[in-house]
């Protein structure tokens, strides 16, 4: 009998955003969730292959917190926080899930100031990153995944194109933060955005708490 399993996508580390492998073995112990074992800073982490000692593949676990301390850049003017996952390679769907696991969403850009701030953070990088733009629900046309109004546009010329196969948006450093549409299933780095909520409590990603366990009739949960 097994619990329904949701991938927990890692942050930073050396696994390019791959999800935790649960359970995993570290220092001759088996871990059935994220752990801070072996870290002085207390950050939760997991292995992304079953045997950490053999492969040494790992990443930090996503946490829903009410601040922007770890892994986030904060715009002091707007209080919005941004996380650039340059080393990750996830599909748009996986990137969205990774942001959601941190109480965030994929990046939406709703004004020129925000675009300028993002461009500043992208300076020095050469990358194409997923943002929240998508037209996956074609009844609504292009929209932001966090439901922000699409009132500011920065499409590159001749974009968006190929409506049948390129339904998710990217931001590109090569065009000074211009937007393109791409095939949602390709693997790319991504940007998350959140507004810190003073009422939110930090919660580790315990994807197995309060989950109804479904077993065959002869099995016990």
């Amino acid at each position: 009998c097994a619990l329904p399993y949701h991938e927990v996508y890692t942050i930073q580390g050396n696994s390019h955003g791959k999800p935790c492998t649960i359970p995993f073995k570290y220092d001759n112990q088996w871990f059935h969730g994220c752990t801070s074992t072996g870290r002085e800073d207390g950050h939760l982490w997991c292995a992304t292959t079953q045997d950490y000692g053999k492969d040494e593949r790992w990443g930090f676990c996503p946490i829903k917190s009410n601040d922007c301390e770890t892994f986030w850049d904060k715009d002091q003017l707007t209080d919005s926080c941004y996380q650039f996952n340059f080393q990750s390679t996830l599909s748009w769907r996986e990137a969205w899930a990774s942001c959601e696991q941190q109480g965030a969403d994929l990046l939406s850009i709703t004004e020129i100031h925000e675009q300028t701030y993002i461009n500043g953070l992208l300076t020095g990088y050469s990358s194409t990153l997923w943002i929240g733009l998508n037209d996956l629900d074609t009844s609504g046309g292009w929209q932001w995944s966090d439901n922000s109004p699409l009132k500011y546009l920065n499409w590159e010329s001749d974009q968006p194109d190929n409506p049948s196969e390129e339904n998710c948006g990217v931001i590109r450093t090569e065009s000074s933060g211009g937007w393109q549409n791409r095939d949602c299933s390709i693997a790319l780095p991504y940007v998350c955005k959140k507004k810190p909520n003073a009422t939110a409590e930090p919660t580790p990603p315990d994807r197995w708490a309060n989950v109804k366990v479904e077993c065959e009739p002869s099995w016990q949960p």
Partner: antibody, heavy 117, light 108 residues
Amino acid sequence: EVQLVESGGGLVKPGGSLRLSCAASGFTFSSYSMNWVRQAPGKGLEWVANIKPDGSERHSVDSVKGRFTISRDNSKNSLYLQMNSLRAEDTAVYYCARPGAGRLDYWGQGTLVTVSS
Amino acid sequence: SSELTQDPAVSVALGQTVRITCQGDSLRRSYASWYQQKPGQAPVLVVYFKNNRPSGIPDRFSGSSSGNTASLTITGAQAEDEADYYCNSRGTSRNPWAFGGGTKVTVL
């Protein structure tokens, strides 16, 4: 209203050839990639081939490579599938399908290809 | 063999709920869509994206997903829901559309 109408199916002997056509209307044909999907009698759906909006890139399932060629004529709003060296296992209903965002949202009614001696 | 795996057949009593599942690696990367096909007819899209329905599809059809598994649920199955159901997702550039083998739903 989006419409896709296939034609060109029929009975053909093994090793023979057929050319299927799909007439599209109700949308800007030249903006969309297009696909052929087939269904053998009593079996499931199998993607066969697709072509980019400008015809610059084509892909097909391994089992038809070198035998089937997908093409399009944007001036005629038409999609084609040239089928050569046909085999009994190619017997199927062939559907023309237009993709939307991550899905195949419009299908034709299908045309039956029967390969038999 | 299909890149997506479905149970071949399920049955449901009239008015009851049935869930059809679809498993495959491409479902981690892409959202599933579901098609209904009745004998002699072309497939019809019933659910797509997270849990969206094209116009004209009754709200008793709903979709969900977790990890590499997608589900189609018919809540309060009707006689006209008896059909084959196929899952589908974006695949790779070499094989851009992955299909499940289909599930035959019988309404008793």
